[in-house]
C-alpha cells in the first residue's frame, strides 16, 4: 500500500510551488494531452548562459514515513534540436530535499537543501518528435530516509536543461491491513528494522472464535520495505463450535457441531442425536442411546445389543456345542462380543452353580468374537444352562444385560477307572472298569496312548472289553494313555491322562500308576 | 536568411481554381512545419491550413475544409495550396509562413503552432 | 472555436508612452499564445510566443504577461517604429485563432 504524500498532478495545478529566482526560469504552465489538460513545471532556458533556477515544493507533513519514495515523470528536449546547439544546454536537472519542523514560507535558501541525486533522462525529445507532439516521458524514482523531522521540501535544481516536470508523487510503503490465515495483521510502515534485517516481524491477532492451535505458533507476518507481506508463520484456527466462512468464524448452524479447534467444517449431528442448538461444540444422544469414551463425537449415538438369536447346545457325550446368531439389533455397533456363562444343577438335590472352574471352553468364554464354542469336560447326571450375552461398546454404559439361554442334561458315563495291569520292555497291558449301570450304554472303548514329549503322533485302540495290551513300544519309555467310552450319543467322559513306562532293557524298574 | 516567396495569385471567377505555390530558401525547409494564413482586404488575419515537416498531418479551417489541399515538395523547397470551388469570401492576401521547432524554446509543444516566419503574401480575387 | 477578443481596437499614444494591449481567450489556453506586428501592405513578424517568451531580434521594451484567459502585450517606451497593428493568436488549439487586431497609432 502506498500513501502518497504529494501528488502533483493530481493537483491540477492548484499547488503553487515556489520558483526562486522569482519570474524567471520554472514555469507552470498547461498543455493538452490525449484531450485532457495536463500541467506542468517547464522551463527552457538553454540559450541563456549558465542557468540556477530552483523550483520548491510546498512543505510536506511527514506523517509517519521514515523514508520516502519520489517518483518523478518529465521530459527532456534533446540540446541538439535547438540552432546551433545551444551552446549552454543541458539535458539533466538536479533534485533536493530539506527537512524541517515548520514550514518556511517563501523564505528559501539553498544551502538547506542536501542533494539527492542529477537526475538524467533515458529518452530525450528529439526534434521530430517535438514536433509531432510525441512525449517522450521519463520516469525516475528515488528513495530519501531515514527522515526524523516534521516535514519537508523537495526542490529541483535547473542548470540550463529544457525540462517540464509533469508528475511529482511522493509516498511512503505500507503493508496494507491483512486477514491471512483467520489473523488479522495490522497496518504496519514499510521499513527496514536494519540492514541486515529487511523484515519487519509482526504479530497477528486471531479473528473473532478463533484461536492459535493448542501447541502451534501463534500467526506471525513480515513487513517488507517494499510494503508487501512475506512469509506467514503459524495459524489461527476457528475454535470449536465455530467454522471457517470466508475470513471469519461462524458458529455452527443448529443441528450441527464442531468438537475441537480445527480446520475442518462443522458436521451434521449424527443419527439418535438431539437437534443441537447454535455454535454446539456436540451433540446429545436421545434417550436410550449411547456414546462409548472412545467413540468420536461425529459417530452415531448407539445402543446395547439385543440378546443373540436361536442359541442352540448340541451334546456330544461329555461335550456341548453351542451355537448361537447375532442379535437382530446390534445397537449400531460393530464391535459386539459374547460372554459364555456356565450352570450346573444335580438333579438329586436340586442344587445349583457355576461351573466355570470344572468345565474346558474351546475358547476363553468371554469377549467372543465368533458366534459358537465347544465345552467340554462336562459331569454326567448332570444339568446344565449356559447363558450367552451379546455386549458392545456401550453395555457398560447400562445395567440391564442382554443375554440368552440354552439347558442340557449330560447322561453320559463317568470316566473309566484306569490301571496298569502288566508291563514288559515292549508292552503295557492296562485295565479298567465303570459303574456296572452304565456299561449297557458303552458301544466300545478307545484307548489313546502316544509316547510322553511326542505330540505330533498318536496311537489309538478300540476294543469292546475291559482291557488292552500295547505292544510294539519302546523300552525304558513313558507313554501317556487315556480311555474314553463310546456311546450312542457320541464320546462319553474320558479317564484322566496316566503315564506309564515300559521296562528297560535290565529288566528292573517300579511300575508306576 | 529565411526567405519566403509566395506566387500563384490572381483574379478568378466564382467556383474556379488557383494554385498558390511559397519558394523558401535560407533553411532547412524539411524542418519546418508549414502553414497559409490569409487577410481579407482591411480585415484581420484568418490561418487557413498547416501542414507537417515531413508532409503530415494536414489541418484545415473549417471555412476551406473539402475545397483546399494543402501539399509540400520538400525536394523543390516548395509549399502549394489548391484552392477549388473558389468562392469571393476568398478574396484575400494569402500568406506562407513556417515554424521551426528549433526556435520555440519550450519543454513540450504548444497543442498547435504559432508562425515564427512569414513570405511577403499573394493576393487572389475571387469575382465575376 | 477558441474566440480571441482584443481590446482596444484602437490605441492613439505618444513617443515614449507605455502602452498596453489585452488579448481575452473564451476558453482557458494555459499560456499557448502569441503576439504579432504588421504594418501595412507588409507581413506581420512574431514578437512574443508562449505569452511571455520574447522572439530572437525583438526589441526587450516589448513584454507579453497572462495565462489562461487573460493577456497583454506591453510596449514600455513606444518608438516611431512602433506604430502598427498588433494581433494576438492562441495555438491551444488546431485552428489556431487570431485576435481581430489593435491599430496603434500616433496621437
Known amino acids: 500500500k502506498e500513501v502518497v504524500l504529494l501528488d502533483f498532478a493530481a493537483m491540477k495545478g492548484e499547488l503553487g510551488w515556489l520558483t526562486h529566482p522569482y519570474g524567471k526560469g520554472w514555469d507552470l504552465m498547461q498543455n493538452i494531452m490525449d484531450d485532457m489538460p495536463i500541467y506542468m513545471y517547464s522551463v527552457c532556458n538553454v540559450v541563456s548562459g549558465d542557468q540556477d533556477n530552483w523550483l520548491r515544493t510546498n512543505w510536506v507533513y511527514r506523517e509517519e514515513a521514515e523514508r520516502i519514495f519520489i517518483e518523478l515523470k518529465f521530459t527532456v528536449r534533446d540540446c541538439n534540436s535547438f540552432p546551433g546547439g545551444a551552446s549552454s544546454c543541458k539535458e539533466t536537472f538536479n533534485l533536493y530535499y530539506a527537512e524541517s519542523d515548520v514550514d518556511y514560507g517563501t523564505n528559501f535558501q539553498k544551502r538547506q537543501f542536501t542533494k539527492i541525486d542529477t537526475i538524467a533522462p533515458d529518452e530525450i525529445t528529439v526534434s521530430s518528435d517535438f514536433e509531432a507532439r510525441n512525449v517522450k516521458l521519463n520516469v525516475e524514482e528515488r528513495m530519501v530516509g531515514p527522515l526524523t523531522r516534521k516535514g519537508f521540501y523537495l526542490a529541483f535544481q535547473d542548470i540550463g536543461a529544457c525540462v517540464a516536470l509533469l508528475s511529482v508523487r511522493v509516498y511512503y510503503k505500507k503493508c496494507p491491513e491483512m486477514l491471512q490465515s483467520l489473523a488479522r495483521f495490522p497496518e504496519t510502515i514499510a521499513v527496514a528494522v536494519s540492514d541486515t534485517q529487511p523484515l519487519a516481524t509482526v504479530a497477528g491477532t486471531c479473528v473473532d472464535h478463533a484461536v492459535v492451535p493448542y501447541g502451534g505458533e501463534g500467526p506471525l507476518m513480515h513487513c517488507t520495505v517494499d510494503g508487501e507481506w512475506l512469509v506467514p508463520i503459524g495459524q489461527c484456527l476457528c475454535q470449536e463450535g465455530y467454522e471457517k466462512v470466508e475470513d471469519a468464524c461462524r458458529a455452527c448452524s443448529p443441528g450441527f457441531f464442531k468438537s475441537e479447534a480445527s480446520e475442518s467444517p462443522c458436521l451434521e449431528c449424527p443419527e439418535h442425536t438431539l437437534p443441537s442448538t447454535e455454535g454446539a461444540t456436540s451433540c446429545q444422544c436421545e434417550e436410550g442411546y449411547f456414546r462409548a469414551p472412545e467413540d468420536p463425537l461425529s459417530m452415531s449415538c448407539t445402543r446395547p445389543p439385543s440378546a443373540p438369536n436361536y442359541l442352540t447346545a448340541i451334546g456330544m457325550g461329555a461335550k456341548v456345542e453351542l451355537r448361537w446368531t447375532a442379535p437382530k439389533d446390534t445397537g449400531g455397533r460393530q464391535d459386539i462380543v459374547y460372554s459364555v456363562t456356565c450352570e450346573q444343577c444335580w438333579p438329586e438335590s436340586g442344587e445349583c452353580g457355576p461351573c466355570e472352574a470344572s468345565v474346558r471352553y474351546s475358547e476363553p468364554p468371554h469377549a467372543l468374537t465368533r458366534t459358537s464354542v465347544t465345552v467340554s469336560d462336562l459331569e454326567p447326571h448332570m444339568n446344565y444352562t449356559f447363558a450367552v450375552e451379546a455386549r458392545n461398546g456401550v453395555s457398560g454404559l447400562v445395567t440391564s444385560r442382554s443375554f440368552r439361554t440354552a439347558s442340557v442334561s449330560i447322561n453320559q458315563t463317568e470316566p473309566p477307572k484306569v490301571r496298569l495291569e502288566d508291563r514288559s520292555t515292549t508292552s503295557l497291558s492296562v485295565t479298567w472298569s465303570i459303574p456296572v449301570s452304565q456299561q449297557s450304554r458303552v458301544w466300545k472303548y478307545e484307548v489313546t496312548y502316544r509316547k510322553k514329549g511326542d505330540a505330533n503322533s498318536y496311537n489309538v485302540r478300540r476294543t469292546e472289553g475291559f482291557s488292552v495290551t500295547l505292544d510294539d513300544l519302546a523300552p525304558d519309555t513313558t507313554y501317556l494313555v487315556q480311555v474314553q467310552a463310546l456311546t450312542q450319543e457320541g464320546q462319553g467322559a474320558g479317564s484322566k491322562v496316566h503315564e506309564f513306562q515300559t521296562l528297560s532293557t535290565e529288566g528292573s524298574a517300579n511300575m508306576a500308576v | 536568411e529565411v526567405q519566403l516567396l509566395e506566387s500563384g495569385g490572381g483574379l478568378v471567377q466564382p467556383g474556379g481554381s488557383l494554385r498558390l505555390s511559397c519558394a523558401a530558401s535560407g533553411f532547412t525547409f524539411s524542418h519546418y512545419m508549414m502553414a497559409w494564413v490569409r487577410q481579407a482586404p482591411g480585415k484581420g488575419l484568418e490561418w487557413v491550413s498547416r501542414i507537417g515537416p515531413s508532409g503530415g498531418p494536414t489541418h484545415y479551417a473549417d471555412s476551406v475544409k473539402g475545397r483546399f489541399t494543402i501539399s509540400r515538395d520538400n525536394s523543390k523547397n516548395t509549399l502549394y495550396l489548391q484552392m477549388n470551388s473558389l468562392r469571393a469570401e476568398d478574396t484575400a492576401v494569402y500568406y506562407c509562413?513556417?515554424?521551426?521547432?528549433?526556435?520555440?524554446?519550450?519543454?513540450?509543444?504548444?497543442?498547435?503552432?504559432?508562425?515564427?516566419?512569414w513570405g511577403q503574401g499573394t493576393l487572389v480575387t475571387v469575382s465575376s | 472555436d477558441i474566440q480571441m477578443t482584443q481590446s482596444p481596437s484602437t490605441l492613439s499614444a505618444s513617443v515614449g508612452d507605455r502602452v498596453t494591449i489585452t488579448c481575452r481567450a473564451s476558453?482557458?489556453?494555459?499560456?499557448?499564445l502569441a503576439w504579432y506586428q504588421q504594418k501595412p501592405g507588409k507581413a506581420p513578424k512574431l514578437l512574443i510566443y508562449?505569452?511571455?517568451n520574447l522572439h530572437t531580434g525583438v526589441p526587450s521594451r516589448f513584454s507579453g504577461s497572462g495565462s489562461g484567459t487573460e493577456f497583454s502585450l506591453t510596449i514600455s517606451g513606444l518608438q516611431p517604429d512602433d506604430f502598427a497593428t498588433y494581433y494576438c493568436q492562441q495555438y491551444n488549439s488546431y485552428s489556431r485563432t487570431f485576435g481581430q487586431g489593435t491599430k496603434v497609432e500616433i496621437k
Open positions: 509562413a513556417g515554424y521551426d521547432s528549433g526556435y520555440d524554446y519550450v519543454a513540450v509543444a504548444g497543442p498547435a503552432e504559432y508562425f515564427q516566419h
Open positions: 476558453q482557458s489556453i494555459s499560456t499557448w
Open positions: 508562449k505569452a511571455s
